[in-house]
């Protein structure tokens, strides 16, 4: 996930927010799956 050629603060911020959103979605899916499997 190189996410482009820009290294300014806004580009870094947007990339960080994307990672957080992605991880939240992945962890949320895993949690729902665990609850479902119980």
């Amino acid at each position: 996930h190189s996410d482009g050629i820009f290294t300014d603060s806004y580009s870094r911020y947007r990339k960080q927010m994307a990672v957080k959103k992605y991880l939240a979605a992945v962890l949320g899916k895993r949690y729902k799956q665990r609850v479902k499997n119980k």
Epitope: H1, D3, Y10, S11, M17, A18
Partner: antibody, heavy 111, light 111 residues
Framework: QSVEESGGRLVTPGTPLTLTCTAS????????MGWVRQAPGKGLEWIGD?????TTDYASWVNGRFTISRTSTTVTLKMTSLTTEDTATYFC????????WGPGTLVTVSS | AAVLTQTPSPVSAAVGGTVTIKCQSS????????LAWYQQKPGQPPKLLIY???TLASGVPSRFKGSGSGTQFTLTINGVQCDDAATYYC???????????FGGGTEVVVK
């Protein structure tokens, strides 16, 4: 290096439509991609973008009517509940800073 | 959503002269510098000129200069050339991308 939009056409109000963005000489999967539109004779309007992780952000006016998604080679803009106000040229562009634009694809919504 | 107000069109300049276009945001952009400038000629997609308020995009002539911070930004074109006749847009990036928006555009006429 270039990007290109496709899928624009004349549709009637309420008809859903999907636009596609493809690239030549660029690995699209390595870049965030944005969508922008421009009504005839009007200014630019930011629609939203998608990160390399597939997470999306949209302008507040979109109100869930548009959805951006991606595969390893394409980025798509799915549009629903279209009205005449959505008549515009739709552009896709590379990076959060929209550093490389396609020529655009014209969407006309008319009854 | 944010509102970006640009210098009213058209702005007229003589070849070799200087053009100044202002862009005012209704709220501070991210990190006080998340603002870009684009040039668009009729029938063409926009082209990124400046990002992060003052950083010149690749291949853009040094006669283009961006400045400003927070809510007030300026694009200056020194030694204006005939080729600079176009419409110029600013784009603000915000803490919440849902607020991202373009300014209304400023047409530059070169005499």
């Amino acid at each position: 290096q270039s990007v290109e939009e496709s899928g624009g056409r004349l549709v009637t109000p309420g008809t859903p439509l999907t636009l596609t963005c493809t690239a030549s000489g660029i690995d699209l999967s390595g870049y965030a991609m944005g969508w922008v539109r421009q009504a005839p004779g009007k200014g630019l309007e930011w629609i939203g973008d998608i990160s390399t992780y597939g997470t999306t952000d949209y302008a507040s006016w979109v109100n869930g009517r548009f959805t951006i998604s991606r595969t390893s080679t394409t980025v798509t803009l799915k549009m629903t509940s279209l009205t005449t106000e959505d008549t515009a040229t739709y552009f896709c562009a590379r990076d959060y800073w929209l550093s490389l634009w396609g020529p655009g694809t014209l969407v006309t919504v008319s009854s | 959503a944010a509102v970006l107000t640009q210098t009213p069109s058209p702005v007229s300049a003589a070849v070799g002269g200087t053009v100044t276009i202002k862009c005012q945001s209704s709220q501070s952009v991210y990190d006080n510098n998340a603002l870009a400038w684009y040039q668009q000629k009729p029938g063409q997609p926009p082209k990124l000129l400046i990002y992060a308020a003052s950083t010149l995009a690749s291949g853009v002539p040094s006669r283009f200069k961006g400045s400003g911070s927070g809510t007030q930004f300026t694009l200056t074109i020194n030694g204006v050339q005939c080729d600079d006749a176009a419409t110029y847009y600013c784009l603000g990036g915000y803490d919440d991308p849902a607020d991202n928006a373009f300014g209304g555009g400023t047409e530059v006429v070169v005499k």
